[in-house]
C-alpha cells in the first residue's frame, strides 16, 4: 500500500495559507477539483471545490477559502485566509474523476494554527500585510456536483452567504504565503 | 433519481446475526459518495450505525463497532449490513442511506426501511 | 460525541400558524473555515422514512415547500414552519453531520391545535 505523507505547515492565527497543488496539466486541467480536511477516524469533508467544469483562473470563494484553478500551468490554488486556531487539521488537494477515485495531488498538509502575534517587530515571520481583490464569483452552491446534481432552492442567508459580491475585498494583515512545491514521485 | 431498497430477514434469534441487504438504483455506487445505514427502535430515536465508501472503507458508529461490519458489492450495486450478537435492543427499523456528510452534510434519499425483531 | 437536543418534544400549532422547534448541539457544527454548519433537518411522518428537509442549517433542499427554513449557527439551530398545514403532522428530526459519530436529536412531534 502507498505510504500516505504529509507536509507540516505552522502558521499563526490571522495568517493565510497559500497552497499550490500541481497536477497534470492534459489530464485534469478542466477536472472538477476539491480542498478537503480530513478529521482522525472520519470520511474527509469536502470544504470547497471548484466548478464544473473548473473554469480557468476563475476565483471560487466559499468562506474563508479561495480556490483559483490555473489551468495554464497546472496547478490548483488554494488560499485560507485569516486563519483560525480551529482550522488546524490535515488537508487534501483533490481531483473527481468518478467512477475512479478522486485522486489526491500529492501529500497531505497538516496545518497547525497556534494563537499568537505573527508580524510583530522581532518576529521571523515574514509577514506582509495585503489586500487581495477577490472578483464577482458564481460560486456553486453545493459541492461537489461531479455525480447527480441537487438544486438549491433556498440561498442562506446573508449571515451565512459565502459568494464574494462583486468587488469585495478581504482585508489581510500580516499574510504569509506558504508555496508547496509539488513532490513528483 | 437515486433510489434505496432494503431487504433481509425480519426475525432473528437473540445471539444471532443480523444480515441486510441494501440495493440502489438509479445511480452507480462506484461513481461516489458514501453509502449509509441508520436504525429506529419502535416509537424512538434514529441512530446511526456506520456508512462506507465504494472502495470499501468503513466508518462505524463506536457503540456499535464491535458488532458491525458493512460491506459493499459494486458489481450488484448493493451494500450490507451484518450485526453480530443481537439482543431485543437491537428490535429496530433499519434504513440504509446516502450519506452527505462528507459534502451537503445530510442523508438523502433514504430507503423505506425494513423492521427487524430480535426474538426467540 | 455531539449530544443533540431538541426541544419541546412535542407542539400543538393551530392550522396556519407558526411552528418553531429548536435543536442544540452539545459542540459547535460549525466549520468556519467554509462557513458551513454542517445540520440537517428531517421529517418524518408515521410509517415512512425520515426525509430531507434543509442541510448545511439553513438550505432547503429541492422541492421543499418554502414554509420551512430553517436558521441558527454554531450550536443554536431552529427550525421554523411559517404557517402549518395538515400535511406537515410529523415527527422532526436534526442531525449533526460535522463530527463522528454522526447524532440526532430525539425528535419533535408537531400536531394540529
Known amino acids: 500500500a502507498t505510504k500516505l505523507t504529509e507536509e507540516k505547515y505552522e502558521l499563526k492565527e490571522g495568517q493565510t495559507l497559500d497552497v499550490k497543488c500541481d497536477y497534470t496539466l492534459e489530464k485534469f486541467a478542466s477536472s472538477q477539483k476539491a480542498w478537503q480536511i480530513i478529521r482522525d477516524g472520519e470520511m474527509p469533508k469536502t470544504l470547497a471545490c471548484t466548478e464544473r467544469p473548473s473554469k480557468n483562473s476563475h476565483p471560487v470563494q466559499v468562506g474563508r477559502i479561495i480556490l483559483e484553478d490555473y489551468h495554464d500551468h497546472g496547478l490548483l490554488r488554494v488560499r485560507m485566509v485569516n486563519l483560525q486556531v480551529e482550522d488546524s487539521g490535515l488537508y487534501q488537494c483533490v481531483i473527481y474523476q468518478p467512477p475512479k477515485e478522486p485522486h489526491m495531488l500529492f501529500d497531505r498538509i497538516r496545518l497547525v494554527v497556534t494563537k499568537g502575534f505573527s508580524g510583530t517587530p522581532g518576529s521571523n515571520e515574514n509577514s506582509t500585510q495585503n489586500v487581495y481583490k477577490i472578483p464577482p464569483t458564481t460560486t456553486k452552491a453545493l459541492c461537489p456536483l461531479y455525480t447527480s446534481p441537487r438544486t438549491v432552492t433556498q440561498a442562506p442567508p446573508k449571515s451565512t452567504a459565502d459568494v464574494s459580491t462583486p468587488d469585495s475585498e478581504i482585508n489581510l494583515t500580516n499574510v504569509t504565503d506558504i508555496i508547496r512545491v509539488p513532490v513528483f514521485n | 433519481q437515486v433510489q434505496l431498497q432494503e431487504s433481509g430477514p425480519g426475525l432473528v434469534k437473540p445471539s444471532e446475526t443480523l444480515s441486510l441487504t441494501c440495493a440502489v438504483s438509479?445511480?452507480?455506487?462506484?461513481?461516489?459518495?458514501?453509502w449509509a445505514w441508520i436504525r429506529q427502535p419502535p416509537g424512538k430515536g434514529l441512530e446511526w450505525i456506520g456508512s462506507?465508501?465504494?472502495?470499501?472503507?468503513?466508518y462505524y458508529n463506536p457503540s456499535l463497532k464491535s458488532r458491525v461490519t458493512i460491506s459493499v458489492d459494486t458489481s450488484k450495486n448493493q451494500f450490507s449490513l451484518k450485526l453480530s450478537s443481537v439482543t431485543a435492543a437491537d428490535t429496530a427499523v433499519y434504513y440504509c442511506?446516502?450519506?452527505?456528510?462528507?459534502?451537503?452534510?445530510?442523508?438523502?434519499?433514504w430507503g423505506q426501511g425494513t423492521l427487524v425483531t430480535v426474538s426467540s | 460525541d455531539i449530544v443533540m437536543t431538541q426541544s419541546p418534544d412535542s407542539l400543538a400549532v393551530s392550522l396556519g400558524e407558526r411552528a418553531t422547534i429548536n435543536c442544540k448541539s452539545s459542540q459547535s457544527v460549525l466549520y468556519s473555515s467554509n462557513n458551513k454548519n454542517y445540520l440537517a433537518w428531517y421529517q418524518q411522518k408515521p410509517g415512512q422514512p425520515p426525509k430531507l428537509l434543509i442541510y448545511w442549517a439553513s438550505t432547503r433542499e429541492s422541492g421543499v415547500p418554502d414554509r420551512f427554513s430553517g436558521s441558527g449557527s454554531g450550536t443554536d439551530f431552529t427550525l421554523t414552519i411559517s404557517s402549518l398545514q395538515a400535511e406537515d403532522v410529523a415527527v422532526y428530526y436534526c442531525?449533526?453531520?460535522?463530527?463522528?459519530?454522526?447524532?440526532f436529536g430525539g425528535g419533535t412531534k408537531v400536531e394540529i391545535k
Open positions: 438509479g445511480y452507480s455506487i462506484s461513481s461516489g459518495y458514501y
Open positions: 442511506a446516502r450519506d452527505l456528510g462528507g459534502y451537503e452534510g445530510a442523508f438523502d434519499p
Open positions: 462506507i465508501y465504494h472502495s470499501g472503507s468503513t
Open positions: 442531525q449533526q453531520l460535522a463530527s463522528f459519530p454522526w447524532t
